[in-house]
């Protein structure tokens, strides 16, 4: 049975040429952790696999960086940006947990970060 | 130029063995993941093993557990195959290639014929 | 055993357009991307696509990929005779600990 849950950073939003983290944390469950992916639509960005660590897309590695932690970091942010973005925890033996953020990039400088969590 | 260019193949009797070598150059090679895939004559791609870019961990496919030793000489930009107890079902072009292969293999090398025949 | 499953061949007139199906399961495609290579008779395979639907410098935009499910596909549009060759769709197993190769496409210009 799945007992986890993905806390996600939610909807954040974020300056145009900044850089945002994209942060999930996987609780309530004793499930090793073996893999990591973090997508886009259909595009695989980048992943953290648990012998192999973390291995980034080469249309996004000049853009993207990885961490904290399971995190992701996206850098030069543009407009094109703006979109769901999906962390998916594959886990044994529970199976996949996936979370969703949804990133706003704003032309001005009004953008406010939705609430932020530390990973312990 | 970033290119990977193979030796070490050959003709060998059933039981017998053989090393497989793979010179990078143009790319730095510590900072890859490596493969090896094979390729049967007129079939498939087989993916036959894997070591990480320090060689500290490698992988290989059920089929060759126990048989072959993937290995790495950075210093040497160098790729190892060592493959020991060959059976016919072996026989294979090898190919070498770069990364572990969750983005693809990018960059292969030309390929090396190994034949396991009595 | 583990398995990408393509069909064995397709075919197509100059300027058609063409699909290749690729099929696997939760622990391969359902779960990483999938990457495509094209063999040329006696040469090693070259990457064609990589993350579903990205293209390396080099390769022409009539390629193209997608991914749905466990299941993915190639096509090619604007076919051309030196398109005529063998086609390997890819992807991680979680399984394996490795990548899966299918078994490949033999496309045929008309």
């Known amino acids: 049975m799945m007992t986890g849950t993905i806390e996600t950073t939610g909807n954040i939003s974020a300056e145009k040429g900044g850089s945002i983290i994209l942060q999930c944390h996987l609780s309530s469950t004793t499930a090793q952790v073996t893999q990591v992916n973090w997508e886009q639509q259909d595009q695989l960005l980048a992943i953290c696999n648990a012998d192999l660590g973390w291995h980034i897309s080469p249309s996004f590695k000049d853009r993207v960086a990885p961490g904290p932690g399971l995190g992701l970091t996206l850098q030069s942010l543009t407009v094109n940006d703006t979109g769901e973005y999906f962390c998916i925890y594959h886990t044994y033996p529970d199976g996949t947990y996936t979370g969703r953020i949804f990133l706003e990039v704003l032309e001005s400088s009004v953008a406010e970060h939705g609430a932020r969590f530390q990973i312990p | 130029e970033v290119q990977l260019v193979q030796s070490g193949g050959g003709l060998v009797k059933p039981g017998g063995s053989l090393r497989l070598s793979c010179e990078a150059s143009?790319?730095?090679?510590?900072?890859?993941?490596m493969s090896w895939i094979r390729q049967a004559p007129g079939k498939g791609l087989e993916w036959v093993s894997r070591?990480?870019?320090?060689?500290?961990?490698?992988n290989y496919a059920d089929s060759v557990k126990g048989r072959f030793t993937i290995s790495r000489d950075n210093a040497k930009n160098t790729l190892y195959l060592q493959m020991n107890s060959l059976r016919a079902e072996d026989t294979a072009m090898y190919y070498c290639?770069?990364?572990?292969?969750?983005?693809?293999?990018?960059?292969w090398g030309q390929g090396t014929l190994v034949t396991v025949s009595s | 055993s583990y398995e990408l499953t393509q069909p064995p061949s397709a075919s197509g007139t100059p300027g058609q357009r063409v699909t290749i199906s690729c099929s696997g399961s939760?622990?391969?495609?359902?779960?990483?991307?999938v990457n495509w290579y094209q063999q040329l008779p006696g040469t090693a395979p070259k990457l064609l696509i990589y993350?579903?639907?990205q293209r390396p410098s080099g390769v022409p935009g009539r390629f193209s990929g997608s991914r749905s499910g466990t299941s993915a596909s190639l096509a090619i549009s604007g076919l051309q005779s030196e398109d005529e060759t063998d086609y390997y769709c890819?992807?991680?197993?979680?399984?394996?600990?490795?990548?899966?190769f299918g078994g490949g496409t033999k496309l045929s210009v008309l």
């Open positions: 290639a770069r990364g572990p292969g969750f983005f693809g293999f990018d960059i």
């Open positions: 143009g790319f730095t090679f510590s900072d890859y993941s």
């Open positions: 070591i990480n870019s320090d060689g500290s961990r490698t």
């Open positions: 939760r622990s391969n495609i359902g779960r990483n991307s």
């Open positions: 993350s579903n639907n």
């Open positions: 890819a992807a991680w197993d979680a399984r394996l600990t490795g990548p899966l």
